[in-house]
Interface confidence: low
Amino acid sequence: LGSATGRSKSSEKRQAVDTAVDGVFIRSLKVNCKVTSRFAHYVVTSQVVNTANEAREVAFDLEIPKTAFISDFAVTADGNAFIGDIKDKVTAWKQYRKAAISGENAGLVRASGRTMEQFTIHLTVNPQSKVTFQLTYEEVLKRNHMQYEIVIKVKPKQLVHHFEIDVDIFEPQGISKLDAQASFLPKELAAQTIKKSFSGKKGHVLFRPTVSQQQSCPTCSTSLLNGHFKVTYDVSRDKICDLLVANNHFAHFFAPQNLTNMNKNVVFVIDISGSMRGQKVKQTKEALLKILGDMQPGDYFDLVLFGTRVQSWKGSLVQASEANLQAAQDFVRGFSLDEATNLNGGLLRGIEILNQVQESLPELSNHASILIMLTDGDPTEGVTDRSQILKNVRNAIRGRFPLYNLGFGHNVDFNFLEVMSMENNGRAQRIYEDHDATQQLQGFYSQVAKPLLVDVDLQYPQDAVLALTQNHHKQYYEGSEIVVAGRIADNKQSSFKADVQAHGEGQEFSITCLVDEEEMKKLLRERGHMLENHVERLWAYLTIQELLAKRMKVDREERANLSSQALQMSLDYGFVTPLTSMSIRGMADQDGLKPTIDKPSEDSPPLEMLGPRRTFVLSALQPSPTHSSSNTQRLPDRVTGVDTDPHFIIHVPQKEDTLCFNINEEPGVILSLVQDPNTGFSVNGQLIGNKARSPGQHDGTYFGRLGIANPATDFQLEVTPQNITLNPGFGGPVFSWRDQAVLRQDGVVVTINKKRNLVVSVDDGGTFEVVLHRVWKGSSVHQDFLGFYVLDSHRMSARTHGLLGQFFHPIGFEVSDIHPGSDPTKPDATMVVRNRRLTVTRGLQKDYSKDPWHGAEVSCWFIHNNGAGLIDGAYTDYIVPDIF
């Protein structure tokens, strides 16, 4: 687990003594884990001493499970405590604006691995002083393969004077088995150093190796401790009911024993596109052969392969007889790869095969149907629009059976697979491109290979439940567990009960569980406050996880609603979730940046890919001004945009020409510039006028306010000539045009280039520039305004619209009959565009995208009457009520 490594702050080399590295030694490293009814509470404490005569940099470095939420972090140095403060992301950002301006994750590195995520903080420790780190994190243990697993990554990098892992388990049902393994220890040493015991409701594991037991050899100063320390256990299931009620909250654990395995109908839908070549297809075939070998005679199955074409092995479900399994294995061994990825076709074929059960194979309708899809890339053939695929799959499955998606490797749009699975009662799992991919695939299959019940409904008295986690599950598998938690109304605890109904193999399953009040009182006496606290936090943890998952598959408004609920609960219960950050008061680096702790996303890069590290000093430093260099992103030669009195400039690369039009509207009107219905991304602009209106004359209007929104990540940016506000709807931080800053939020990077422009870059979206136009301060007529330019739009969907967005895709036009116009310097011509004939005029406009002060002249065909005939519909169709 944690490590502390020292680095000299001067060039002077020091001889390491005893367990010290460069004068720094780890006095103690302790992991305390307390489990109460599957809710695990971990506290990691590390004390590091700098015995050197100069400051040293140390790293506190550990890995925690991906599913865990950090709930506390504190550092104590020289008698001063620096305590983590959990806030919503935006407030943390606002409060420690300097950290955001730097564009760094402010010295705290969080990186995502397979099942663990890394947490690292670098600190400067004064000479002859000590520092203590304490990290608290929590998780709900999931039952898999008939056991719960506590995983603690151990990697101190040097010998530790007092090393200890202490796991204390309390399970009201009683503990039926308990084991602990340290993969990094020789067998005899493990037997000597790991103490484990369990009796009744209590279990205990203690690992406390001496310094000599940690050494990799008798004379070595290097440590053996490098790997996973695992504690596995299960609970007694003599009683079918496991219902805990404490402090107006309940937790219901459902994992009935002695049920007959249900026969299943399973269809495997496998990507055989070209990108699967090599190791991936080999591993997929190996896994399929093994899986087919483990099929039960009562099961029915089929295989669907999709590349450019879609092919099925049989086209309907066949029994898993020895002959059929042999033939299917031959088919698997023999298939070869195809070109593209017709994901939609493959899935719909697989769904059709399972849907035949309803239509033509009623004798199989009491089996558990399962669809498993494996892909390594994006859809490129047939229907490729993701929202259309989601719609097709949802409409074809119609809730009848779960869809499990396996995303092979890192080129897969895992988010898309997750949404699809969630919408269809399943889940997605990443298969890492590694030597053990075959085992990963088999491991996944083994979790769903033995369905015991389908359509499991866990019901609670409606008048008693105030909040509830997911209580309907499509299937229950052998070795797993269904957990439901909720809040109970006042005075309803004693009468609380649970009714469970499901379909099993050849029978209906139905039970009622009542609360055993005497047993509950006894438990509270034994475990007291911790039990109450853990049941409530278990409910909060599950609720937040569900809200975060649900966010992925709903519309913009509902997403905002779910986000605010999850945020509120994260704050109420002090969890660092994707919506919150923990800022550490009193800590700063040499630039005055303060660290903030965030939850990394599934796609966070591995540690070695993250940017430069920062080291923190434990003192309440005054931030010193710091500027990052300006974003020198190369701009395209000619861009599409809108500027000044709004002149819309549309570059048409296919024609190597440019079109222009103006929109004449009143100040205050908001126009839709870009709107991508596939992602919800939008840019709207509000017009402003001159300070003083000139009588009898058309007054210029300009963009005075822009709203850029990416609802998929709850991102909003409001830009005016005065300020730049991040997430204004959530009271977000305000930056000024005097700042030089890089702001990052969930796949959107905003670069503010001091008094000049800002660039917004959206992952898998577009890149846009906002130019600041300052007018002479003493002007009684004009006021400052904004220009907006599109630097890159090729990744935006074909359905993107808006006054600018509709031109992100090729537009055909022909110009003929060029003749002198009313102004001899500006010829007129006839343009045919969208089957309309228009009279257009050649003119000059200014493009300020590369030179915000002087601009570059662009020659273009000007379309009169507010772009009539060129733009879709009338310009008034683009008037919208709000900036977001």
Epitope: G345, E352, N392, N395
Partner: antibody
Framework: EVQLQQSGAELVKPGTSVKMSCKAS????????MHWVRQRPGQGLEWIGD????????NYNEKFKSKATLTVDTSSSTAYMQLSSLTSEDSAVYYC?????????WGQGTTVTVSS | DIVLTQSPASLAVSLGQRATISCRAS??????????MHWYQQKPGQPPKLLIK???NLESGVPARFSGSGSGTDFTLNIHPVEEEDTATYYC?????????FGGGTKLEIK
């Protein structure tokens, strides 16, 4: 049971607008696209456009882009289509229909007659 | 846009005989084994009713005398044996890309 209940027949004057409704029941309204189809007297079926109530995403047939506007009210599980600048050419039966890739449920149709 | 051409425009078939309606698309609406073509029946004063989805899959509740076939650009709806109640107009429809389009319709009369 899935049902799509459309609003009653409309007799309107040329140049005016009309807004018709389609109330859905028996399924999760936000999970399916709602399409609108026109059928002029004695003629075939023409696709106008569709809307996804889950996100308000819309697609329009180019021919109807400046004629039809599709909206939804998820709180009442109702889809709406507004037709503007009506002419006698717009006299037809307008159907709403739920879809995945095909139309499995249809409303009974709203007859619009444009006459001065 | 994909144009669907139905033929014949009208058809008179004796009771108990086979009715065959053809639909040709201006471009392929199929992947190698999946076709985005669907068939509907419409009787006067009623909305259309789905008969066949994905070229050949019978919608539940539709009599087995209706069948569909074809892929790529050429598709066929067969009714055999035709019954009195099959008097209606039949439409094909694709869902390959936006805009979805319908064929012009085939009016079936029972002799």
């Amino acid at each position: 049971e899935v049902q799509l209940q459309q609003s009653g027949a409309e007799l309107v004057k040329p140049g005016t607008s009309v807004k018709m409704s389609c109330k859905a029941s028996g399924y999760t309204f936000t999970s399916y696209w709602m399409h609108w189809v026109r059928q002029r007297p004695g003629q075939g079926l023409e696709w106008i456009g569709d809307i996804y109530p889950g996100t308000d995403s819309t697609n329009y047939n180019e021919k109807f882009k400046s004629k039809a506007t599709l909206t939804v009210d998820t709180s009442s599980s109702t889809a709406y289509m507004q037709l503007s600048s009506l002419t006698s050419e717009d006299s037809a039966v307008y159907y709403c229909s739920r879809s995945g890739d095909y139309y499995d449920y249809w409303g009974q149709g709203t007859t619009v007659t444009v006459s001065s | 846009d994909i144009v669907l051409t139905q033929s014949p425009a009208s058809l008179a078939v004796s009771l108990g005989q086979r009715a065959t309606i053809s639909c040709r698309a201006s471009q392929s609406v199929s992947t190698s084994s999946y076709s985005y073509m669907h068939w509907y029946q419409q009787k006067p004063g009623q909305p259309p009713k789905l008969l066949i989805k994905y070229a050949s899959n019978l919608e539940s509740g539709v009599p087995a005398r209706f069948s569909g076939s074809g892929s790529g650009t050429d598709f066929t709806l067969n009714i055999h044996p035709v019954e009195e109640e099959d008097t209606a107009t039949y439409y094909c429809q694709h869902s390959w890309e936006i805009p979805w389009t319908f064929g012009g319709g085939t009016k079936l009369e029972i002799k």
